[in-house]
């Protein structure tokens, strides 16, 4: 806080603003009749240097000239860029206890002359926008630097606007607030930027442009689409544009897509016909504009129009499968199943399915509509039956898909050979087979069908299936395949009027079961012991069980137990053993084995055979 220099003055030579690397002389002079006493020789002038309000140096040793008691000149060098404060103080040497008294001060700014501004770029957003230019100022000058943007053009007019850079703000862009209109489309404009500060000035090279070079059209607005005759594949996209637009770019894509369809339209006048849309599909549309065919810039993309194309009648054929079960000697239950059409085939919301079961000689026809993807009916066991299903939306129905109802596993000669199931990874199984050896008629197709081997799965869950062409002998099944679950897999070979099948179990990943089977009873019949058990609960099986093991040993024996290995069958829950001694107490238990290993043992049961065993 320097008082208004009552005691004296401070001056700087050559100037208070100097280029980097230059020296300056600071002179501090006392006003007449100011000082410590009537003895001027006791006046000592000192110069203090402050940077950011912090005292950094006493320049006592930098005196270059001294009029004892009246004035002193100090040379300052190596000043850093920016502002430095120098304060001159009066030190009265005969009174050591008094602090030096401020006389006056000065700020010296060190900087550089501005470089010529470069890379001038001007834009006008929209036909009614205003011209704004930006540039690269070059190195920081560390001084207040004024920039003047000057635009010259037709009608002998020059427009200019100014801004400045200092340590608080940067000036590298100016909006002139002036609009260039389309009537000047052919005119040339010249823009230049001049920079000036206390150490010099510089000017950019002139930058020449036309209206078309700098005007970026506003993005199109009010976008809408009209579908011709409610067509799902043809529509007219309409939008509003600025008047001078001659070129548009359209891009559109289904909402879940990752790549755009791109179209260029010349002189579209806010209208363009699209002919390749997918019915009943959510689309996103955007448009960009340009004022000139070859030059100029594209506008930003418009806001998206999101809309769904109308429905069209379904195409494609349904994938049908069925199950046949005899109810009694003259009736059978037919369960038809089909897969939903994919969206590109459904082309709308499927409202219902039309199902027909027909006896080939046309004696009987059963028809129904359902919203489900399955249908069950009881029909006579006599006659040859055929089924057909079609899918309907609001615009119409797909062509019906036909399938002959045959006895799927009725012909042993059509049974595929050497069926195997190998786990490929966590969620699929590779099924392979060999064709039937002595088929009477040609195989038209194979069906690979699978179902989880869990209680009630036949009644609760529809089957999963894959249609395989007759020249393929493998299928990778993945739909609804989960690890640690065992599936029954059937491979059907179908001819025109017959069917044969082979069955196998498989899993995609397996572990040793969590527990062993639970022995429920041990009974003695005709000198043999029958072991009965309950199967391991489905979640604890952890894959396909290959076999069970029954272990036994004499109670309190330390010898290794004996064992009997049984091939796993779901229907089997008891097994005889015949190598136990009578009137000896045995301990028995069971384990289960998957491809991954053996389960812990199940419950232990003691038993003492009574009769003559062996």
């Amino acid at each position: 806080n320097i008082d208004v220099c009552k005691l004296g003055t401070v001056t700087v030579q050559p100037a208070p603003v100097i280029p980097l690397g230059s020296a300056a002389n600071i002179s501090c002079s006392l006003n007449p009749k100011q000082g410590c006493s009537h003895y001027p020789s006791s006046n000592e002038l000192i110069l203090l240097k402050f940077v950011n309000d912090v005292l950094v140096e006493n320049l006592h040793g930098k005196k270059v000239h001294d009029h004892t008691g009246h004035s002193s000149t100090f040379q300052v060098t190596n000043l850093s860029l920016g502002m430095t404060l120098f304060v001159c103080k009066l030190n009265c040497s005969n009174s050591q206890k008094k602090p030096p008294v401020p006389v006056c001060g000065v700020e010296i700014s060190v900087g550089v002359a501005p470089e010529p501004p470069q890379n001038i770029s001007c834009v006008q957003e929209g036909e009614n926008g205003t011209v704004a230019c930006s540039w690269n100022s070059g190195k920081v000058t560390y001084l207040k630097t004024n920039y003047t943007l000057q635009l010259s053009g037709p009608n002998n007019l020059t427009c200019q606007k100014q801004c400045f850079s200092d340590n608080r703000q940067n000036c590298n862009r100016l909006d002139l607030g002036i609009n260039l209109s389309p009537d000047l489309a052919e005119s040339r404009f010249i823009v230049r930027v001049t920079a000036i500060n206390d150490l010099g000035n510089s000017s950019s090279l002139p930058h020449t442009f036309t209206f078309l070079d700098i005007v970026i059209p506003l993005p199109p607005w009010d976008i809408r689409i009209n579908f011709l005759n409610a067509s799902g594949s043809r529509g007219t996209l309409q939008w509003e544009d600025e008047g001078q637009v001659v070129l548009n770019q359209l891009r559109y894509q289904p909402l879940n897509s990752t790549s755009w369809n791109m179209v260029n339209a010349t002189n579209a006048k806010g209208k363009y016909d699209l002919r390749d849309l997918r019915p009943f599909t959510e689309y996103e549309f955007q448009i960009s504009s340009k004022l000139h065919l070859s030059g100029g810039s594209w506008s930003n993309w418009s806001e998206s129009l999101r809309t769904r194309t109308p429905e069209e009648e379904p195409v494609g054929i349904l994938d049908i499968w069925y199950m046949k079960q005899d109810i009694d000697y003259d009736r059978q239950q037919i369960s038809l199943f089909w897969k939903s059409l994919n969206p590109s085939e459904a082309r709308g919301k499927i409202l219902h399915y039309q199902v027909t079961l027909q006896e080939v000689t046309k004696k009987t026809t059963l028809q129904n509509t359902t919203r489900h993807t399955s249908w069950t009916r009881v029909i006579p066991r006599t006659g040859a039956w055929t089924a057909s299903v079609s899918a309907a939306n609001s615009k119409g129905a797909s062509a019906p898909t036909h399938i002959n109802i045959v006895d799927l596993c009725g012909t042993g000669l059509l049974a595929p050979h050497q069926v195997s199931a190998k786990s490929e990874n966590m969620d699929n199984i590779l099924v392979t087979w060999q064709p039937p050896k002595k088929a009477d008629s040609a195989v038209r197709e194979y069906i690979v069908e699978w179902r989880a081997l869990q209680p009630g799965s036949i009644t609760k869950f529809p089957p999963h299936w894959l249609r395989i062409p007759p020249d393929n002998m493998s299928a990778l099944i993945s739909e609804n395949i989960k690890p640690y679950i065992c599936y029954e897999i059937r491979v059907h070979a179908l001819s025109e009027s017959q069917g044969g099948c082979s069955s196998i179990r498989g899993d995609s990943k397996h572990k040793a079961p969590v527990s062993g089977p639970h022995i429920t009873a041990i009974t003695e019949k005709k000198e043999r012991l029958f072991i009965s058990w309950t199967h391991i609960p489905f979640p604890e099986q952890r894959g396909c069980i290959l076999h069970y093991r029954i272990y036994w040993k004499e109670r309190d024996s330390t010898a290794q137990p004996e064992l009997c290995e049984i091939q796993y069958r779901r229907s089997q829950n008891s097994h005889p053993i015949s190598s136990l001694q009578p009137r000896v107490t045995y301990v028995l238990w069971m384990t289960a084995v998957t491809a991954a290993g053996e389960s812990p043992q199940g419950n232990e049961r003691e038993f003492c055979p009574q009769g003559k065993a062996n």
Epitope: T130, G153, N155, L157, C159, Q160, K161, Q162, D175, L176, G177, I178, N179, L180, S181, D183, L184
Partner: nanobody, 126 residues
């Protein structure tokens, strides 16, 4: 109602300087432009310079560029035209005018300015 009042005209020797003032009142929007025109006897009205009150952009006719400066004093609602190195052909009545203008092509068009002052005479003698 917008009112414009020019002052500062007079007789000046060739090579001399003059500062014209235009005091404006009733301008309800900072988007106005204030411009100076001049009309010599027997000639059409000619654009000299203009200033945009909001952003401070200045527009000059090339005929006087380098010899005149237009600037404003917001506190006094006054726009000044400083003219230096005056020539005999600068003799004319100088008018101040205002309008809502932002198109480049419209600045020199007198019909785009809605309000006009009475004018002040500038005479340059040899």
């Amino acid at each position: 109602q917008v009112q414009l009042q020019e002052s500062g005209g007079g007789l000046v020797q060739a090579g001399g300087s003059l500062r014209l003032s235009c005091a404006a009142s009733g301008l309800t929007s900072s988007t106005y432009v204030i411009g100076w025109f001049r009309q010599a006897p027997g000639k059409e009205r000619e654009f000299v310079a203009a200033i945009m009150l909001s952003g401070g952009t200045t527009i000059y006719a090339d005929s006087l560029k380098g010899r005149c400066t237009i600037y404003k004093d917001n506190a006094k609602n006054t726009v000044y035209l400083q003219m230096n190195s005056l020539k005999l052909e600068d003799t004319a009545v100088y008018y101040c005018a205002s309008g809502l203008i932002y198109r480049y092509s419209d600045f020199p068009r007198s019909q785009k300015y809605n309000f006009w002052g009475q004018g002040t005479q500038v005479t340059v003698s040899s």
